[in-house]
């Protein structure tokens, strides 16, 4: 516990002190006092540097003195033989004696008192920045007018902080400007403008004079501008060294002016104003800005419109333009949005055709559709070339976005029919010679494929079986071959309205309008063994003349067999109708006169016994197209005959083209349209 005074005596004082002693005393007086230590008696064995016995006075780490020998007072009015004055409140006294004393020494008597210290003068480091005031047990600092004492109670500064400037325009100067600024001060000024405005500071060179930098280039007094994470400065010297116009890009600016104890100059003066935050005129590729301006600032709104073929993709929605607003932070809203090339996507596939995988599906890319040649061709024209248009669709110059349609090529056999050896008035044929040939198994008959969904046959073939089973693509009708061929399933049978239905069909004598259409459930896939025959045109070019040649094919009766196993065919000439009338009916079911002959019938045959017969009904009488020699059309359908191996009667298909087209149109499915 600190005391104001005290006494220190050597061991056994005033008797002789013992040998080999080491004793210490820790003196402590109250804070703010120094210590006056004085000896009134000193009798200690003398030795060089007091090496044997000694009393040592230590202040902190410093030895204030080391005493030995005898002392007496030099002043008759004072008993003090030795004294010490320290400006600190702590002191240590250490007494040491060695192992022997040649004489009897009595030691020492000492006293300490707390003494006042003058902190204002007693120390090298001045405790106060301005005025120092000493008092007993302490001191206090004070300041000149307009200065205030900082929290450390030692430093004085000017009260120049805490000002917040919110006006859009203003002026700020250092304290006392243009008189010298206060030393040892830190002035902080805050400019806080509305969001969306940036602080712009302007200075004139002559309005700035601040103590210059030291030899190392460090400013002793400095002016610093801080805007967010950006700093301008520190600045010092005679004349402003920085840019005279500082665009801070921020609505908040802190101005910090720091001065030291020396070298005051006139200081500085600045002006500031708030500029609407500028947004950069960004280069957004493939787009146009509206309105177009040299400079855009806070709250400006632009419409960014993509050029043709470009779009803004946000999520899964594509748009051609978007709005962007210059925001308070100097950045554009919607800045992530970009005008990207329109992507038309993977082109749709088409039935019976293909499209090569495009290298790119972006705007301007080109694709080509092709049909599966030679069995299909592009019906709706346009060449099959499509480009990726600005609206995101694949577009053709002729068809626009409509897809090409691959439809079967008609009337072109993969292999032409050649009459080989004679077989009962005909020849063996291959299905590739007559790819339109359809086989009906009940009743045993034929038909002609005219497109993907329709089979043309004779009315008498289907009148008794409205759900016929049909096959295409096989030369042989042996079961194992049919199992490998394509079976066609009917959806509906359409018999010509002019065909007279009878109770007893076996007794029929009127085969007028012997024509029917079978609508199929599923489309037929065309190929080398399955391909339709053309229909006749309506022009007079398709009117048959006597002698015109046509081909018939089927699995009907031959001389040797009731039913042919493999397809047979023959080339027959058209004959006048009277030739058919003249032939005696082989097994008449009625009077010869009862048989009806009409202009809806073609008479053909009579040459070399070549004729159609039972089981060939419904098959096509195929004639070369007068306008395209590579194609065949169905001029007739095997209908009836007076006698096999003579002349036969065929339904004249040309007379029914309108009914055929109308029936197909009225009974088509949307996917066929």
């Amino acid at each position: 516990e600190p005391t104001m005074y005290g006494e220190i005596l050597s061991p056994n004082y005033p008797q002789a002190y013992p040998s080999e002693v080491e004793k210490s005393w820790d003196i402590e007086v109250p804070e703010g006092y120094g210590i006056h230590l004085y000896f009134t008696h000193l009798d200690i064995e003398l030795s060089e540097n007091c090496a044997y016995d000694s009393v040592q006075i230590i202040s902190g780490d410093t030895e204030e003195g080391r005493l030995c020998g005898q002392r007496s007072s030099n002043n008759p009015h004072s008993p003090i033989v030795e004294e010490f004055q320290v400006p600190y409140n702590k002191l240590q006294v250490i007494f040491k004696s060695d192992f022997s004393n040649e004489e009897r020494f009595t030691g020492f008597a000492a006293y300490y008192v707390a003494t006042d210290i003058n902190e204002c003068t007693d120390f090298v480091d001045v405790p106060c920045s301005h005025f120092c005031n000493n008092f007993i047990g302490g001191y206090f600092c004070s300041c000149p007018p307009e200065y205030f004492l900082h929290d450390d109670m030692k430093n004085c500064g000017v009260n120049c902080s805490g000002d917040v400037f919110t006006a859009l325009i203003g002026e700020i100067a250092s304290p006392n400007y243009p008189k010298p600024y206060p030393e040892n001060s830190r002035c902080e000024y805050q400019i806080r403008l509305e969001k969306g405005f940036q602080v712009v500071v302007t200075l004139r060179r002559e309005d700035f004079d601040v103590e210059a930098a030291d030899s190392a280039g460090n400013c002793l007094d400095s002016l610093v501008f801080v805007a967010g994470d950006r700093q301008f400065g520190p600045y010092c010297g005679h004349g402003f060294p920085g840019p005279l116009n500082i665009e801070t890009k921020s609505n908040a600016l802190d101005i910090i002016f720091q001065t030291d104890l020396t070298g005051q100059k006139k200081g500085w003066k600045l002006r500031y104003h708030g500029d609407p935050m500028p947004c950069p005129k960004e280069d957004t590729p493939n787009s146009v800005w509206e309105p177009a301006k040299a400079k855009y600032v806070f709250r400006d709104v632009v419409q960014i419109t993509c050029l043709d073929g470009f779009e803004v993709v946000e999520g899964r929605v594509g748009a051609t333009s978007f709005y962007s607003t210059c925001q308070s932070n100097g950045k554009w809203s919607n800045s992530k949005l970009k005008c990207q090339p329109v992507d038309c996507g993977i082109p749709e596939s088409i039935e019976n055709g293909k499209v090569e995988d495009p290298e790119s599906t972006l705007f301007g890319s080109v694709i080509r559709y092709t049909c599966e040649e030679p069995y299909y061709y592009m019906e709706n024209g346009g060449g099959g070339e499509y480009h990726c248009a600005g609206n995101g669709s694949w577009v053709n110059e002729v068809l626009g976005p409509e897809l090409p349609k691959c439809v079967p090529v008609c009337g072109v056999p993969r292999e032409p029919f050649e009459e080989k050896q004679r077989i009962i008035g005909g020849s063996d044929a291959d299905i590739k010679n007559f790819p339109w040939q359809v086989f009906f198994d009940n009743p045993w008959a034929g038909g002609a494929l005219i497109n993907e969904y329709w089979v043309l046959t004779a009315a008498h073939v289907v009148e008794g079986n409205r759900e016929p089973t049909m096959y295409v693509g096989s030369t042989s009708v042996q079961t194992s071959r049919l199992a490998k061929s394509k079976m066609l399933t009917p959806e509906h049978v359409f018999i010509h309205p002019g065909w007279k239905l009878l109770e007893v069909p076996e007794g029929r004598t009127n085969f007028d309008n012997d024509i029917a259409l079978v609508r199929l459930k599923d489309p037929v896939k065309m190929g080398p063994t399955v391909s339709p025959i053309c229909l006749p045109g309506t022009s007079s070019d398709y009117n048959l003349m006597d002698g015109d040649l046509g081909l018939i094919s089927g699995w009907g009766r031959t001389e040797k067999r009731d039913r042919a196993v493999r397809l047979k065919a023959a080339r027959l000439p058209v004959a006048p109708l009277r030739k058919c009338k003249e032939v005696k009916v082989e097994k008449p079911t009625a009077d010869a006169e009862a048989y009806v002959f009409t202009p809806n019938m073609i008479c053909a045959g009579g040459e070399k016994g070549m004729d159609s017969c039972k089981g060939d009904s419904g098959g096509a009488f195929a004639v070369q197209d007068p306008n395209d020699k590579t194609k065949f059309y169905a001029a007739g359908l095997v209908s009836w005959g007076p006698q096999c191996g003579t002349y036969g009667l065929y339904t004249r298909v040309k007379n029914y083209v309108d009914w055929i087209m109308k029936t197909m149109q009225e009974n088509s499915t949307p996917r066929e349209d």
């Epitope: 009708v477 042996q478 194992s480 067999r561 196993v565």
Partner: antibody
Framework: EVQLVQSGAEVKKPGASVKVSCKVS????????MHWVRQAPGKGLEWMGT????????IYAQKFQGRVTMTEDTSTDTAYMELSYLRSEDTAVYYC????????????WGQGTLVTVSS | DIQMTQSPSTLSASVGDRVTITCRAS??????LAWYQQKPGKAPKLLIY???SLESGVPSRFSGSGSGTEFTLTISSLQPDDFATYYC?????????FGQGTKVEIK
């Protein structure tokens, strides 16, 4: 009407071969597809194979691959079936059968030839 | 090869009974299935072809149905002449295999 006349019964030793003939009348062999079917005593029908004139190839049931050979002599309208490496399980009645048309599998059957394999 | 599984292997029934025999293919054979009747010492006789078509001359009490892999032969009213062994046969694939047979015997 197609008629099929087969060769007579045969008795063979294990390991031997047998060749059964089938003569067609009422039609020509070129117009027909000939199949061969066998039936062991008290057992079911087993299809052995056929000659496909369209493809010009012979198709055999997996079971008989490598042991059976089916041939045709169109000049005499006769079909042949030869089975080699005979074993007792091959004892059966062997039929030649013509393939039907328009979905009918078998049209005409031969009278059958009994082949007995016994040591 | 496509395997044909016929069931049951034996069936005991009386005259006038309705009899059903089933045949299952190991994979789809569309409608390419036939049913035969065989009596001892005789060649098989075709009853049904293309799964449901009745061969000419076969009594209408015989009927066939099914397509794909499941097929049935039905005798609507069993007659004394109908006691025999019945076989199904597929002819969709190149190998025209038979089922193992169903013997219909008098109860």
């Amino acid at each position: 009407e197609v008629q099929l006349v087969q060769s007579g019964a045969e008795v063979k030793k294990p390991g031997a071969s047998v060749k059964v003939s089938c003569k067609v009348s009422g039609d020509t062999l070129t117009e027909l597809s000939m199949h061969w079917v066998r039936q062991a005593p008290g057992k079911g029908l087993e299809w052995m194979g056929t000659f496909d004139p369209e493809e010009g190839e012979t198709i055999y049931a997996q079971k008989f691959q490598g042991r059976v050979t089916m041939t045709e002599d169109t000049s005499t309208d006769t079909a042949y079936m030869e089975l080699s490496y005979l074993r007792s399980e091959d004892t059966a009645v062997y039929y030649c059968v013509t393939e039907g048309l328009a979905g009918i599998p078998f049209d005409s059957w031969g009278q059958g030839t009994l082949v007995t394999v016994s040591s | 090869d496509i395997q044909m599984t016929q069931s049951p292997s034996t069936l005991s029934a009386s005259v006038g009974d309705r009899v059903t025999i089933t045949c299952r293919a190991s994979q789809s054979i569309s409608s390419w299935l036939a049913w035969y009747q065989q009596k001892p010492g005789k060649a098989p006789k075709l009853l049904i072809y293309k799964a449901s078509s009745l061969e000419s001359g076969v009594p209408s009490r015989f009927s066939g149905s099914g397509s794909g892999t499941e097929f049935t032969l039905t005798i609507s009213s069993l007659q004394p002449d109908d006691f025999a062994t019945y076989y199904c046969q597929q002819y969709n694939s190149p190998s025209w295999l038979f089922g193992q047979g169903t013997k219909v015997e008098i109860k």
